[in-house]
């Protein structure tokens, strides 16, 4: 029917030619100068989240798109004006010629043109939508860029402060080292002086020894006389002692035993007559070093030395190896008695360990180990347990065989991770194991689904953080 042929004329305008009978109609339409097709590589539909475009590039593209939009709008307006002008001219011609046949053709052509215009408008709307889509995407990209920039800035600031801290620490350590070197030099000098003094002393002593040897010869002569006198004296002393003991027992048959001043554990405190709960000063075995411990003189016959207590979260248990070694906290509240003391004590004789637990629902349970001891510090205070009984689970929540003790600065667990840093607190971690009574203290209603809480798996499961715990020891023969 109507054969539309599209071609380009010399001035770059689109030319629509319509052949109808003997008449030929040519319409010259203005061209869209800057409009690119959506398939152009210039516009990307994919938002590249992993490798964002450069900021300047994005701005440039945005400007290009804005120009295209403006040109399209202008072109549309030109097209409308052009069609209206042409229509007017054609209508005047048709009226003048008054050829009815041609009028019909013109109306048909007009309709076609209008359809074409509508089609162009639709295409432009699509282009406009695409442009808007692109703009939105670019805005998103820009937002992502600014966010990642902020993130990077924060990271840089954090790293800078970390570097500053390390530098401070470094300079502090350097000063310390220098001070130690100075001290070392002074000590060396004093040692040298002492050595010289000792040499003088040795030579003096040699001469004194010579004199003494001479005197010994003389003394040997008098020795036999002295021996006799000594024998006589001993006899007299024995007689006096016998007389004294006889007279004392006659006067007072209940001679008061001198009260023991130093105690190794709460069992000794209890046996000395102190049967009230409270804090007592204990002494390290074979030493004068003291430690304060809470003694439970009521539970299960008394004499229990409390080595750990958690009850209210008032003490931070994320402590260093040294602090776990010597003990920390408040003996009348939350505290850790100290690995060194417990190790020395439990290697002197056989001890039992009782672990008393409370949950947030008012329930209580315990685990009792009939034999407990800790290895020395050289063996990382490894825990040794035998013979479990009690109500806090049939299986031991302290992994068997016993593990080494680990802290935030002393990683001795069986995990590639650092259990103490991850779960907080010092404990005999496995990898990381079913218990940690030194974990984070969580209050009620915040104590479930907590991987780093106060855990005793075979009683309350893995995510439950307990309300209170007490670890206590007592000699097995108490």
């Amino acid at each position: 029917y109507n054969n539309f042929r599209k071609s380009m004329d010399s001035i770059g305008k689109k030319q629509y030619q319509v052949q109808h009978g003997s008449c030929s109609y040519t319409f010259l339409l203005p061209e869209m100068d800057n409009c690119r097709s959506s398939s152009s590589p210039y516009v990307s539909n994919a938002v590249q989240r992993d490798a964002p475009l450069e900021y300047d590039d994005s701005v440039q593209r945005l400007q290009v798109l804005e120009n295209i939009m403006e040109n399209n709008t202008q072109w549309l307006m030109k097209l409308e004006n052009y069609i209206q002008d042409n229509m007017k001219k054609e209508m005047v011609e048709i009226q003048q010629n008054a050829v009815q046949n041609q009028t019909a053709v013109m109306i048909e052509i007009g309709t076609n043109l209008l359809n074409q215009t509508a089609e162009q408008t639709r295409k432009l709307t699509d282009v406009e939508a695409q442009v808007l889509n692109q703009t939105t995407r670019l805005e998103l990209q820009l937002l992502e860029h600014s966010l990642s920039t902020n993130k990077l800035e924060k990271q840089i600031l954090d790293q800078t402060s970390e570097i500053n801290k390390l530098q401070d620490k470094n300079s502090f350590l350097e000063k310390k080292v220098l001070a130690m070197e100075d001290k070392h030099i002074i000590q060396l000098q004093s040692i040298k002086e002492e050595k010289d003094q000792l040499q003088v002393l040795v030579s003096k002593q040699n001469s004194i020894i010579e004199e003494l040897e001479k005197k010994i010869v003389t003394a040997t002569v008098n020795n036999s006389v002295l021996q006799k006198q000594q024998h006589d004296l001993m006899e007299t002393v024995n007689n006096l002692l016998t007389m004294m003991s006889t007279s004392n027992s006659a006067k007072d048959p209940t001679v008061a035993k001198e009260e023991q001043i130093s105690f190794r554990d709460c069992a000794e405190v209890f046996k000395s007559g102190h049967t009230t709960n409270g804090i007592y000063t204990l002494t390290f075995p074979n030493s004068t070093e003291e430690i304060k411990a809470y003694c439970d003189m009521e539970a299960g016959g008394g004499g229990w030395t409390i080595i750990q207590r958690r009850e209210d979260g008032s003490v931070d248990f994320q402590r260093t190896w040294k602090e776990y070694k010597v003990g920390f906290g408040n003996p009348s509240g939350e505290y850790w008695l100290g690995n060194e003391f417990v190790s020395q004590l439990t290697n002197q004789q056989r001890y039992v360990l009782k672990i008393h637990l409370k949950d947030w629902e008012g329930n209580e349970a315990y685990s009792l180990y009939e034999h407990f001891y800790l290895s020395s510090e050289e063996l990382n205070y490894r825990i040794h347990l035998k013979g479990l009984t009690g109500t806090a689970g049939k299986i031991s929540s302290i992994s068997q065989p016993g593990n080494d003790f680990s802290t935030k600065d002393g990683d001795n667990d069986k995990c590639i991770c650092k259990c103490s840093q991850m779960l907080t607190g010092g404990w005999w971690f496995d990898a990381c194991g079913p218990s940690n009574l030194n974990g984070m203290y969580y209050p009620q209603r915040q104590n479930t689904n907590k991987f780093n809480g106060i855990k005793w798996y075979y009683w309350k499961g893995s995510g439950y953080s307990l309300k209170a715990t007490t670890m206590m020891i007592r000699p097995a023969d108490f």
Partner: antibody, heavy 121, light 108 residues
Framework: QVQLVESGGGVVQPGRSLRLSCAAS????????MHWVRQAPGKGLEWVSL????????YYADSVKGRFTISRDNSKNTLYLQMNSLRAEDTAVYYC??????????????WGQGTLVTVSS | EIVLTQSPGTLSLSPGERATLSCRAS???????LAWFQQKPGQAPRLLIY???NRATGIPDRFSGSGSGTDFTLTISRLEPEDFAVYYC?????????FGGGTKVEIK
Amino acid sequence: QVQLVESGGGVVQPGRSLRLSCAASGFTFSSYGMHWVRQAPGKGLEWVSLIWYAGSNKYYADSVKGRFTISRDNSKNTLYLQMNSLRAEDTAVYYCARGPLRYFDWPSDYWGQGTLVTVSS
Amino acid sequence: EIVLTQSPGTLSLSPGERATLSCRASQSFSSSYLAWFQQKPGQAPRLLIYGASNRATGIPDRFSGSGSGTDFTLTISRLEPEDFAVYYCHHFGTSPLTFGGGTKVEIK
């Protein structure tokens, strides 16, 4: 028998300095933290400063921060309080008191008899 | 800073009577960080109670402590002549350590 004996008190003019000492005996001095606590005439007790057993950590009341310095010499079993830029309100009896054992938290269980510091022009 | 307020300021009682001294804290803290001291004129303070309720070595059982959170109490069940003195509550958990203003227990 735990004993704490303070010395170094006396009359001093405002702005001047004074150094108090506290000689300790009857316990392992190097294992215990030590406090200075003061009491103005007719008034209540006011905590001044605390030093840890090894001297690594020191704490001060806001009223003396920047002016007073606590220190110790474990080889001599002695605690010190260096008081600079003294003010009239620093007039008090200064007590030396035994504090916590190593990292344990513990109230002052043994006190000295105190030394009087009078700041007056 | 934890501020400790003691009441009453002065308590006038006769020997044999019961004394109840109050100590209120400006914010809640663990009772294991509360202590009570007794001070007589011209003498150094003496530790009576630690951990809010534990008697120190050598302290008679007529002295007892209780309380938690922000409200603490020292009770002397039957006053003896030697008990007339000033009593201080003391918080030793965090720096700065603080003392209450004191309660004077005097003979009526």
